[in-house]
């Protein structure tokens, strides 16, 4: 009988955690350097070795004396019954061909958990159990006592299970949920005694796989590879994950470090082609993804260096750059951006190998700029690097405008008293600080004698003393590199303040909408001139140029203010500079109620009636247009006399009301009245909003008809 | 009878280091989850530490993470409580508990730890 | 961490009585919630644990409920024997943590 090849030496070890049956055998009558491919058919049984509840071939190469080992992973727990083991083994393979036969079993290797148990009455299994949500689980209880009728609860819900032998019961839970990071509770208890025993599942949420994972390298010397690793387990200590990159070209596998990124060294040998695994494991599972790209193609260049904007004139200036080197024959495409107050104002593209540079053109002069720079590969766009970022000003330029100017003229004392006021350039004209204002005075009853005023920034005006004669003023604004063009405006022997009449007008939210009548004559412009604080005695003068087809302009400001009256005066600008007034017109943005009632003196007392008067009050004082008087009058008579009506108070009291509705009468004749009779009186302004404050009434009562006898 | 026994406390000074040691009998000890949880007097119940049956997982009170070590010996049936760089704010009575799952349904009968200098 | 909120300090019925103690949870912690008793100078017992189920030994005048986050211990027909602190417990997110605790005062 040919020799036969068994197994032998067969040893089966627990490892109860994991429910492993651990199996290790070795073949003794192999020659001495034979190696051959043989299976072991491996029989389990449960309980009693009749009942074989797994069968399986395990086909592996033997030498002699080598051990070989083999694991199964048990659904019951191993503690909830007796398992049995045995094998045979035959040679399959083509050397030999007359061993293909099985040899005989070996002996049953028997496993029993149960009999290295404490003697506790009861005891569930398994213990620690960790597995994923979905998953099926079979639990058991062993019990040492016959006559307890034991229960078991799942999360406080009775479970209803099959028994295995009189002392066992085994309960399938199938699709177990995830419940929370404490795990799942199972109890058991006895129904007599006080016998209880609990256990915990630990049902993890499923193990996700890695999410967008990519590569790049910076420098074609290292890859860094990312990902988003999948959501959290639900578990506090159980479940940690490993994850492994390997490179099926090169065969190289590293272990990472980090759950999100891994480097990766770049292969001296010009590898160009790269076929990556990430493999994300813990002790439930592993999740794969794969990524395939050539190098060249995922190169996200460093950010550009030695950045340096040169030549910086008031127009122009010149940013260079070097970049990082991303092989020898790559061209990077490099991108500028221009910012001027926080936008954007110029873009532009260009291709570098090593060096770059860019003008940039058109630029205001005395402004701070940030120019910004970023380079990505020209050839396989994968990333932009990041910004590099340099900040600079502009040189100055002379200014470009001329100073707004405007002016006040007074007579005093037989001179002329010029008041110049000037707006300061705003930021685009000034083209750098504005350092002095010179005011020449023309004097143009005799052109040759001129007179320079030099004027430090940042005054916005002066005072200037002329005699009777005509002068035409040319102011300039001046910074460190030039001057300004010339604002000219004229001023003549003649104030100008001729009389005109006073318009009113309504004013908005919008403002004061203004118009004039055009000016037959030749006419350069018009100047609208008002004072932001009326009767303050600095006045915060303010004027609009307009040019000379305009008839109609709306002022605005934030400083106006409802109850404050505004004057305007509109001024036309001759050929010669010189402006004359044309129109006033005074209103309100807004109008109030009377502040306050006038004072009112009562005469010509007699029987039947008596005269009010009142004085004229500064109407410029009062938030809104006086437009009448009312005159309240109470007695005790019970019908209103003529040209009165019945009012009512706020307090209520009835009285009677005349309308007086001429905002120039000052007088006031109450006739009618009763001999010896008592009356109240109170008179208050209105304006198109309302009347004034309620006062005090002021009481009288006329005499008898006999008393001046 | 089912019964836990906490080794003698005791005053200690701030800084110092002491072991506590609670001794099971009456059950098979390796069969249950086991527990330390303290009590300053007149307040309430805290959790200190927790371990599985055979040692291999523990799960603490976060701030006392890094100075008390919980473990267990299942020869001997004894749980243990190392605990350092001890603070006045560890004075309490320190309980062992075997846990059914994570509630605990035996407790021994307390020791008391004073940290004071 | 889950902060478990018993708002009655002390609690005053009379024999006979019944008496609900109550527990709040500061977030869903489902039913892994436990309810301890201890008498003046003794420690802890377990009454209840997975919010409603009695413990082996526990006089059935103990009754447990609720879920999510609030939570009740109900003794109907109080004993003397009963006058003790009582305390909840909730696991079902580490840490482990209990109420500050209810005591039972007879009238």
């Known amino acids: 009988e040919p020799l036969s090849l068994a197994p032998e030496s067969l040893e089966v070890s627990i490892d109860s955690a994991r429910q492993c049956l651990h199996l290790k055998w070795s073949v003794h009558n192999l020659a001495y350097h034979q190696e051959l491919k043989m299976v072991f058919q491996i029989e389990i049984s449960r309980i009693k070795t009749s009942n074989v509840i797994w069968v399986e071939n395990y086909s592996t190469t033997v030498k002699r004396n080598q051990v070989l080992r083999w694991s199964w992973e048990s659904k019951l727990p191993l503690e909830c019954a007796k398992h049995s083991v045995r094998m045979r083994g035959a040679v399959d393979d083509a050397q030999v061909p007359e061993l293909r036969f099985w040899s005989n079993w070996t002996s049953w290797e028997e496993v029993d958990v149960q009999s290295s148990l404490g003697h506790d009455p009861l005891f569930v299994f398994p213990k620690d159990k960790l597995v994923e949500e979905g998953s099926n689980v079979t639990i058991c209880y062993v019990s040492r006592s016959h006559q307890n009728n034991i229960s078991c609860y799942l999360e406080g819900v009775r479970m209803h299970g099959e028994q295995l032998d009189p002392n066992v019961c085994v309960f399938h839970l199938k699709n177990v949920p995830f419940i929370r990071e404490t795990g799942t509770n199972i109890y058991c208890k006895a129904d007599q005694g006080d016998v209880i025993k609990g256990i915990v599942l630990f049902v993890s949420k499923v193990f996700e796989e890695p999410k967008d994972f990519s590569c790049e390298t910076r420098d074609l010397k290292t890859l860094n590879c990312t990902w988003a690793p999948g959501s959290d387990a639900g578990l506090l200590t159980q479940l940690s994950q490993s994850y492994t990159l390997f490179e099926s070209f090169s065969g190289k596998k590293t272990l990472c470090k980090y759950k999100s990124w891994c480097n990766w060294q770049v292969s001296p040998d010009s590898q160009e082609m790269y076929n990556f695994t990430l493999t994300a494991e813990n002790y439930l599972r592993k999740r794969s993804v794969h990524l395939l790209f050539n190098l060249t193609h995922r190169v996200h260049p460093m950010a550009p260096f030695n950045v340096f904007v040169k030549n910086v004139s008031a127009t122009n200036a010149t940013m260079t750059w070097k970049v990082h080197s991303i092989g020898n024959y790559s061209t990077l495409l490099c991108q500028i951006e221009l910012y001027g107050e926080g936008k954007v104002i110029q873009k532009q593209n260009v291709s570098v190998k090593v060096n770059g540079k860019h003008l940039m053109k058109k630029l205001e002069p005395s402004t701070e700029y940030a120019a910004q720079v970023r380079c990505a590969n020209a050839n396989h766009f994968w990333k932009w690097s990041e910004w590099t970022r340099r900040n600079f000003t502009t040189a100055e330029a002379a200014p470009s405008e001329a100073p707004d100017v405007w002016r006040n003229v007074k007579s005093v004392q037989g001179h002329c008293v010029v008041t110049l006021f000037w707006k300061p350039l705003s930021k685009l004209q000034a083209n750098g600080k504005i350092l002095f204002y010179n005011v020449v005075l023309e004097n143009l009853d005799r052109p040759s004698t001129l007179k320079l005023l030099s004027i430090p920034a940042p005054a916005n005006g002066t005072e200037l003393t002329l005699d009777r004669c005509s002068y035409q003023i040319h102011v300039t604004a001046n910074n460190s590199v030039g001057t300004s063009p010339a604002s000219v405006i004229a001023v003549s022997g003649d104030p100008g303040n001729k009389e005109v009449e006073e318009e009113r007008v309504k004013g908005t939210e919008d403002g004061f909408c203004l118009s004039w009548k055009p000016q037959p004559g030749d006419v350069t412009g018009y100047v609208v001139e008002w004072c932001e604080r009326p009767g303050d005695p600095l006045c915060d003068l303010q004027w609009k140029n307009l040019g000379p087809n305009t008839t109609s302009t709306v002022v605005s400001s934030d400083a106006f203010r409802p109850g404050v009256r505004y004057n305007f005066r509109i001024y036309g600008i001759s050929t010669e500079r010189i402006p004359y007034l044309l129109e006033k017109k005074t209103g309100y943005s807004q109008e109030l109620v009377p502040s306050d009632n006038p004072q009112v003196l009562m005469s010509n007392l007699t029987s039947y009636s008596f005269t009010l008067s009142w004085k004229d009050y500064a109407a410029e004082s009062q938030p809104g247009f006086v437009q009448g008087y009312s005159l309240y009058l109470k007695s005790k008579a019970a019908r209103c006399l003529p040209g009165s009506e019945k009012a009512v108070l706020s307090d209520d009291s009835i009285c009677c009301k005349y309308k007086i509705d001429n905002p120039k009468q000052k007088t006031f004749v109450v006739e009618n009245l009763q001999p010896a009779s008592f009356y109240e009186f109170f008179l208050t302004p209105y304006t198109s909003v309302g009347e004034g404050p309620q006062g005090a009434f002021t009481k009288v009562t006329t005499p008898d008809e006999y008393s001046h006898i | 009878e089912v019964k836990l026994v906490e080794s003698e406390g005791g005053l200690v000074q701030p800084g110092s280091s002491m072991k506590l040691s609670c001794t099971a009998s009456?059950?098979?000890?390796?069969?249950?989850?086991m527990a330390w949880v303290r009590q300053v007097p007149e307040k309430g119940l805290e959790w200190v530490a927790n371990?599985?049956?055979?040692?291999?997982?523990?799960y603490y009170l976060d701030s006392l993470k890094s100075r008390f070590i919980i473990s267990r010996d299942n020869a001997k049936n004894i749980l243990y409580l190392q605990m350092s760089s001890l603070k006045s704010e560890d004075t309490a009575t320190y309980y062992c508990?075997?846990?059914?799952?994570?509630?605990?349904?035996?407790w021994g009968t307390g020791t008391t730890v004073t940290v004071s200098s | 961490d889950i902060v478990m909120t018993q708002s009655h300090k002390f609690m005053s019925p009379s024999v006979g009585d019944r008496v609900s103690i109550t527990c709040k949870a500061s977030?869903?912690?489902?039913?892994?919630v436990a309810w301890y008793q201890q008498k003046p100078g003794q420690s802890p017992k377990l009454l209840i644990y997975?919010?409603?189920t009695r413990h082996t030994g526990v006089p059935d005048r103990f009754t447990g409920s609720g879920s999510g986050t609030d939570f009740t211990l109900t003794i109907s027909n109080v004993q003397s024997e009963d006058l003790a602190d009582y305390f909840c417990?909730?696991?079902?997110?580490?840490?482990?943590?209990f109420g500050a605790g209810t005591k039972l005062e007879l009238k």
């Open positions: 417990q909730q696991y079902s997110r580490f840490p482990l943590t």
């Open positions: 977030q869903d912690v489902d039913t892994a």
């Open positions: 009456g059950f098979t000890f390796s069969d249950y989850y």
């Open positions: 508990a075997r846990g059914l799952t994570w509630d605990f349904d035996v």
């Open positions: 371990i599985n049956y055979d040692g291999s997982s523990t």
């Open positions: 997975l919010a409603s």
